[in-house]
Interface confidence: low
C-alpha cells in the first residue's frame, strides 16, 4: 500500500515519540517564513535549512529536529537530519519532502526555513594556455609585511597543496562538504578538481605571484570538481571556522568566499554572525553581469564584496556576461588574466579571470593591512580599503545606466604605507535598496554597527520624492527616504563615518511656512553640524527658493524650503571641526558638484533649494553631487538654479593621536 506521498512501498506507522506529545505551539502572532532561491535551476528541493530563533540552545535544536522527524513519520514520511547547526546560527539541515514544509514552519522555535541551493566558483575559464613561471626582478613587488600575523581561510575546491607557489603556506583542513558532480560519466581529474582553489590560494599568498606572501592559509572544500557547492555546505564550512576560532583563538582571521549563489537569507545571516565575531569576510561579487544584491554572499552587508576590473581599469567581460555591479559591491580589484598557480603541475602557472580572482586580491590586501594593524575592526578595514582605492578610474558606461550611480568607482590598491592612516576621518557612502513606486514607499540606508551616520540624503530618478530624514531605529540612527505620489521610487543615501567617542543627535525644525524658509542649527555646546536633511509631506514643494547664503557666524545652520521640515545632524567628538562649502550655479545644470579640500572629509551633502526638479544629492568619495532634471524639461531659468552644499570635517584629535604614535 502506498502512502499519500507515494514515496514508500509500504506504509508503516511510526512509533509515538516521547516528545511528540509536547507539541508546543509557536509563539502567538509569530509566523515562520519559507524562502527559496529565485533562480530555479539553482534550487535543491528536498533539502532544507531550518533556522531557529536566535536564543535557541543546541538541545532545543536537536529536540525540534526530532519532533519534526516524529511528526513526519506519523504521516508516513521519512526525514533525515543531515546536520544540527550551532556556533553561528541555531537550526538544522534536513532531507525531507516539500509536503512537510507547512508542518515544519509550525514547529516551536522556528524562525524561517530556506530550501538549499547551489553556489558556484566565480572564475572563467578554468584552464587557459599554460604559461612559464614569471621571472621577477629584484625591484618587483616586495611588500614589507606580507600578512604573516593573519590566517586566511579559503572556502573553495580542493587544492594542490604541494604546488611550489603555496607549499608550506596552505594547510588543508579535513573539512569537506560538496555535492556530487553532475552527470553520470563525470570523470574526476585531480588537476581539474584542484584548479580553482589552487589558483586563488596562489593569488592570496603565492611565493611569486601572491599579494600577501607571508599570509598562512587554511582550505575548506565546499566546491566540487565542477566548481559547484551548496548553501548548506558553505554554512557548515562557516560554522567550522567559527568553532575553530572558539576552540583555538588566533590572530586576525580573513575568510575568502570566491563563490556565489542566488540571494540567500540564511547564508547572509551566517556571514553577519561571523563578521560580528570579528572575522573579515571577502567575497566575489559574481560573474553574472547583474546586480550583486541578487546573489549571496555578495549581498550580505557585513561582507566585503569585490567586483572585477582589468589592467585598463575597465569592468571585466566574461564571455557574454561579466562582473556584477551595484550598491552591494564595495570595490573592484584586478580580475582579468590573473597569473597564478596552476594545478596541472607543481611548478605550472596559468591565467584565470573572474570576481573570485578580484576577491582574492582584496583578501591579500586585507591580510597585509591586518598584519600591520591587527586591532583593526571590520569597519575600519573596509573604510581603509575604500580610502586607499584608486578613484573614478572605471568606465561606468559598461554598467547599465540605472546602476552607474549605485556602483562604487573604486579599484583596490595597497596603501602607500601600512601605518600612519590613523589621523584620517574615514567616511563612505551607503545606498539603500530601491523603495519601489508606491505612494508611501520608503527606503532605508544603514551604517555598520561601529560607524556613525553623519548625514542622510535621497535620490529619485523621476524627481518625485518627499526628501529624507534621520531617525532612530534599534538604538541607532538610520537614513530614511520618502517616495512621492507618481514617483518611480527613491534611494536613501547614508554617509557612514568612523568617529571614535562621537555623540551625535538630530535636531529638527518643522515647516516654517515663512517666506525665509525653514532653519535649524546645532545649539548644544561643542556640537558641530555634519549633515542636513529635509523632508516634506506636500507632493510638490514648488519653486520657492530660500536664501542660499547663511548669515555670517552661523555655519552650524541648515536651511531649507518653508514647507519642509529640516533635520540637522549634530555631533560632538574630540577635536571634530566642520565647515560648510557651497557651489551654486545660476543657470540650469543637470549636475552641480562641490568637493572638500585635501585633509578634509565630506560628511554631508545636500541640495538647495529642495524643489521638485532636484533629483537628489549624494556623496561620491569627497565630492557632493547634486543632480537635477534634464534642463530641457525644467521651465524657467530661475527654477533651474541649484546649489550643492557640502559639509567638510576633520578631526584634530585623530591627527594628534597619529603624530604621537610616530
Amino acid at each position: 500500500q502506498e502512502d499519500e506521498d507515494g514515496d514508500y512501498e509500504e506504509l508503516v506507522l511510526a512509533l509515538r515519540s516521547e516528545e511528540d506529545g509536547l507539541a508546543e505551539a509557536p509563539e502567538h502572532g509569530t509566523t515562520a517564513t519559507f524562502h527559496r532561491c529565485a533562480k530555479d535551476p539553482w534550487r535543491l528541493p528536498g533539502t532544507y535549512v531550518v533556522v531557529l530563533k536566535e536564543e535557541t540552545h543546541l538541545s532545543q535544536s536537536e529536540r525540534t529536529a526530532r519532533r519534526l522527524q516524529a511528526q513526519a513519520a506519523r504521516r508516513g514520511y521519512l526525514t533525515k537530519i543531515l546536520h544540527v547547526f550551532h556556533g553561528l546560527l541555531p537550526g538544522f539541515l534536513v532531507k525531507m519532502s516539500g509536503d512537510l514544509l507547512e508542518l515544519a514552519l509550525k514547529l516551536p522555535h522556528v524562525d524561517y526555513i530556506e530550501e538549499d541551493s547551489s553556489v558556484f566558483a566565480q572564475s572563467i575559464p578554468w584552464n587557459l594556455e599554460r604559461i612559464t613561471p614569471p621571472r621577477y626582478r629584484a625591484d618587483e613587488y616586495q611588500p614589507p609585511d606580507g600578512g604573516s600575523l593573519v590566517e586566511v581561510y579559503l572556502l573553495d575546491t580542493s587544492i594542490q597543496s604541494d604546488h611550489r607557489e603555496i607549499e608550506g603556506r596552505v594547510m588543508v583542513t579535513d573539512f569537506e562538504n560538496v555535492p556530487e558532480e553532475d552527470g553520470t560519466r563525470f570523470h574526476r581529474q585531480a588537476s581539474k578538481c584542484d584548479s580553482h582553489g589552487t589558483h586563488l590560494a596562489g593569488v592570496v599568498s603565492g611565493r611569486d605571484a601572491g599579494v600577501a606572501k607571508g599570509a598562512s592559509m587554511r582550505s575548506l572544500r565546499v566546491l566540487n570538481c565542477q566548481g559547484k557547492g551548496t548553501v548548506s555546505g558553505t554554512l557548515i564550512g562557516l560554522e567550522f571556522i567559527r568553532k575553530s576560532q572558539l576552540v583555538q583563538p588566533v590572530g586576525p582571521l580573513v575568510v575568502l568566499l570566491p563563490l556565489a549563489g542566488g540571494y540567500s537569507r540564511v547564508l547572509n545571516a551566517a556571514c553577519q554572525r561571523l563578521a560580528r565575531a570579528g572575522v573579515v569576510l571577502v567575497t566575489a561579487a559574481g560573474n553574472f553581469r547583474d546586480d550583486a544584491c541578487l546573489y549571496s554572499p555578495a549581498s550580505a552587508p557585513e561582507v566585503i564584496t569585490v567586483g572585477a576590473t582589468n589592467a585598463q581599469d575597465q569592468p571585466v567581460t566574461l564571455g557574454t556576461l561579466g562582473t556584477n555591479f551595484g550598491r552591494c559591491v564595495d570595490l573592484f580589484a584586478p580580475g582579468e588574466d590573473i597569473i597564478g598557480a596552476s594545478s596541472d603541475c607543481s611548478t605550472c602557472f596559468v591565467s584565470q579571470s573572474g570576481t573570485s580572482q578580484a576577491a582574492a586580491h582584496v583578501a591579500g590586501i586585507a591580510a597585509m593591512m591586518l598584519s600591520a594593524e591587527p586591532e583593526l575592526t571590520l569597519a575600519e578595514l573596509r573604510q581603509r580599503l575604500i580610502h586607499f582605492s584608486a578613484k573614478d578610474v572605471i568606465n561606468e558606461a559598461w554598467f547599465p545606466e540605472d546602476q552607474r550611480v549605485l556602483t562604487p568607482n573604486l579599484v583596490a590598491a595597497l596603501p602607500p604605507s601600512t601605518h600612519g592612516a590613523g589621523w584620517q576621518l574615514f567616511c563612505r557612502t551607503v545606498w539603500s535598496a530601491h523603495s519601489g513606486p508606491t505612494r508611501m514607499a520608503t527606503a532605508v540606508a544603514r551604517c555598520a554597527p561601529d560607524e556613525e551616520l553623519l548625514s542622510c540624503s535621497s535620490f529619485s530618478r523621476s524627481g518625485k520624492r518627499r526628501g529624507e530624514r534621520m531617525e532612530a531605529q534599534g538604538g541607532k540612527l538610520v537614513c530614511r527616504a520618502h517616495n512621492a505620489f507618481g514617483g518611480e521610487g527613491v534611494y536613501a543615501i547614508a554617509r557612514c563615518c568612523l568617529l571614535p567617542q562621537a555623540n551625535c543627535s538630530v535636531h529638527t525644525a518643522p515647516p516654517a511656512e515663512a517666506s525665509m524658509g525653514t532653519r535649524v542649527h546645532c545649539h548644544q555646546q561643542g556640537h558641530v553640524l555634519t549633515g542636513c536633511s529635509s523632508h516634506w509631506e506636500v507632493e510638490d514643494l514648488g519653486t520657492h527658493k530660500p536664501p542660499v547664503l547663511r548669515p555670517r557666524g552661523q555655519p552650524n545652520q541648515c536651511v531649507g524650503h518653508r514647507e519642509a521640515s529640516i533635520h540637522a545632524s549634530c555631533c560632538h567628538a574630540p577635536g571634530l571641526e566642520c565647515k560648510v562649502k557651497e557651489h551654486g550655479i545660476p543657470a540650469p545644470q543637470e549636475q552641480v558638484t562641490v568637493a572638500c579640500e585635501e585633509g578634509w572629509t565630506l560628511t554631508g551633502c545636500s541640495a538647495l533649494p529642495g524643489t521638485s526638479h532636484v533629483l537628489g544629492a549624494y556623496a561620491v568619495d569627497n565630492t557632493c553631487v547634486v543632480r537635477s532634471r534634464d534642463v530641457s524639461t525644467t521651465g524657467s531659468t530661475s527654477e533651474g538654479a541649484v546649489t550643492a552644499v557640502a559639509i567638510c570635517c576633520r578631526s584634530r584629535h585623530l591627527a594628534q593621536a597619529s603624530q604621537e604614535l610616530q
Epitope: 507515494g6 514515496d7 514508500y8 512501498e9 509500504e10 508503516v12 535543491l44 528536498g46 533539502t47 521519512l78 526525514t79 533525515k80 543531515l82 532531507k95 525531507m96 538549499d116 555535492p179 556530487e180 558532480e181 553532475d182 552527470g183 553520470t184
Partner: nanobody, 126 residues
Framework: QVQLVESGGGLVQAGGSMRLSCAAS????????LGWFRQAPGKQREFVAA????????YYADSVRGRDTISRDNTKNAGDLQMNSLKPEDSATYYC???????????????????WGQGTEVTISS
C-alpha cells in the same frame, strides 16, 4: 527500518568474475540510491558504485569503471554488482547501502547512506 543482506562473495582467481547481490526488505523508500562500498583490512570504507531508482543512471569509482556493472530490480527490491577482470587489490568486504532520501545525483560518501548490510567477503587470489 530497511534491512539489507548481501550474498555472492567468496574466493576467485585474478582475472575472473563474480556477481554480488543485495536484497532489501522492510520499509524501503521508492526513491533511493543503492550503493556498493568495500573495505579492505586496515583501510577506510570506499565507494565502488551507485545506481538511481530508475536503473538507467549509474556511477562508478575510477578504480572499477569499465570492469564493474551495477544493476537493480525494483520489483524485487534487489540490486547486483557484476565484477569482471578482478585483481588482488579488489579483495575486501563488500557492503551494499541505501541512501533513503538523496540530496545529490549520486552519493559516494559513507555519511550519506542510512542503511548498511553486514557485508560479504571477496578474496581474489593471484
Amino acid at each position: 527500518q530497511v534491512q539489507l543482506v548481501e550474498s555472492g562473495g567468496g574466493l576467485v582467481q585474478a582475472g575472473g568474475s563474480m556477481r554480488l547481490s543485495c536484497a532489501a526488505s522492510g520499509r524501503t523508500p521508492r526513491h533511493y540510491i543503492l550503493g556498493w562500498f568495500r573495505q579492505a583490512p586496515g583501510k577506510q570504507r570506499e565507494f565502488v558504485a551507485a545506481i538511481r531508482e530508475s536503473g538507467s543512471r549509474t556511477y562508478y569509482a575510477d578504480s572499477v569503471r569499465g570492469r564493474d556493472t551495477i544493476s537493480r530490480d525494483n520489483t524485487k527490491n534487489a540490486g547486483d554488482l557484476q565484477m569482471n577482470s578482478l585483481k588482488p587489490e579488489d579483495s575486501a568486504t563488500y557492503y551494499c547501502a541505501v541512501d533513503q532520501y538523496p540530496t545529490t545525483e549520486f552519493s559516494t560518501q559513507v555519511g550519506h547512506y542510512d542503511y548498511w548490510g553486514q557485508g560479504t567477503e571477496v578474496t581474489i587470489s593471484s
